[in-house]
């Protein structure tokens, strides 16, 4: 079972990304990830989290925003935004430590 080593009870989440095997997945928590790659429109992916919960605590940047929640299909209707572009000297890093 690929999610055997997850902490606590599993939750069912909406799965919307190119790598989803179906409309839902099961994991330790639900995720929404909004990513903007250079020169492209932001992509919003929904899925399940089992590792590195610290990503959920990272602050949004102009390139990425991570959101996590812990209840049944809680990621279904969540919409994220990115931080507005900041001057280079004020840009937050992606490292959340």
């Amino acid at each position: 079972d690929p999610v055997k080593p997850s902490r606590g009870p599993l939750v069912t989440c909406t799965c919307e990304s190119p790598h989803c095997k179906g409309p839902t997945c099961r994991g330790a928590w639900c995720t929404v990830v909004l990513v903007r790659e250079e020169g492209r429109h932001p992509q919003e992916h929904r899925g399940c989290g089992n590792l590195h919960r610290e990503l959920c605590r990272g602050r949004p940047t102009e390139f990425v925003n991570h959101y996590c929640c812990d209840s049944h299909l809680c990621n279904h209707n969540v919409s994220l935004v990115l931080e507005a572009t900041q001057p280079p000297s004020e840009q937050p890093g992606t490292d959340g430590q």
Epitope: K4, P5, R7, H19, T31, V35, N50, L51, H52, L55
Partner: antibody, heavy 118, light 108 residues
Framework: QVQLQESGPGLVKPSQTLSLTCTVS??????????WNWIRQHPGKGLEWIGY???????YYNPSLKSRVTISVDTSKNQFSLKLSSVTAADTAVYYC??????????WGQGTLVTVSS | EIVLTQSPGTLSLSPGERATLSCRAS???????LAWYQQKPGQAPRLLIY???SRATGIPDRFSGSGSGTDFTLTISRLEPEDFAVYYC?????????FGQGTRLEIK
């Protein structure tokens, strides 16, 4: 079959920046199930975790190296990279890249020896 | 930061014997994210056990893992010549990821 391959200079001068790239084949670096790690091993010593990157570009680093480390990802090339600045002889090591999943670090590159010397 | 301490540092045994390797954490860790690796000279580490007790793909059933809280064990029930190597435990899945210092399993 997933494969990881490190590449980059085997010799770096002191005070310069070490740069390595890990190319992933047989699987997508953009899958949300995986985290992409760098690990190093000093000659005759144990394993030291350097940091990881997620497909989103979010990174976490070993606190002892954080001030000198940058990890980046290029999903279009299915690659992720390591930069370690201001290197000294103490950074001489075999550097590995590895994929992390719920099943641990399940795939590793073969490792590349980087020597810091003038 | 959690420290993993492996013991013994070196274990000298003969083929056919049973090997018991210990990994102790400085504080309680999730058994879901404790792994064991084998490394031979000149090679990358190879995943043996994840989630404390689940064998990785292709790993023979003579390798088993157990434990909880702060104390974890890798057992090799009957040593084969190819099992003599260095073994590392690891905490993964949250930062900082840490490795034990290793146990060298050598032929007696």
């Amino acid at each position: 079959q997933v494969q990881l391959q490190e590449s980059g200079p085997g010799l770096v001068k002191p005070s310069q920046t070490l740069s390595l790239t890990c190319t992933v084949s047989g699987g997508s670096i953009s899958s949300g199930e995986y985290y992409w790690n760098w690990i190093r091993q000093h000659p005759g010593k144990g394993l030291e975790w350097i940091g990881y990157i997620y497909y989103s570009g979010s990174t976490y680093y070993n606190p002892s190296l954080k001030s000198r480390v940058t990890i980046s990802v290029d999903t279009s090339k299915n690659q992720f990279s390591l930069k370690l600045s201001s290197v000294t002889a103490a950074d001489t090591a075999v550097y590995y890249c590895a994929r992390e999943s719920v099943a641990g670090f399940d795939y590793w590159g073969q490792g590349t020896l980087v020597t810091v010397s003038s | 930061e959690i420290v993993l301490t492996q013991s013994p540092g070196t274990l000298s045994l003969s083929p056919g014997e049973r090997a018991t390797l210990s990994c102790r954490a400085s504080q309680s860790v999730s058994s879901s994210y404790l792994a064991w690796y084998q490394q031979k000279p000149g090679q990358a580490p190879r995943l043996l056990i994840y989630g404390t007790s689940s064998r990785a793909t292709g790993i023979p059933d003579r390798f088993s893992g157990s434990g909880s809280g702060t104390d974890f064990t890798l057992t090799i029930s009957r040593l084969e010549p190819e099992d003599f190597a260095v073994y590392y435990c690891q905490i993964y899945g949250s930062v900082p990821i840490t490795f034990g210092q290793g146990t060298r399993l050598e032929i007696k």
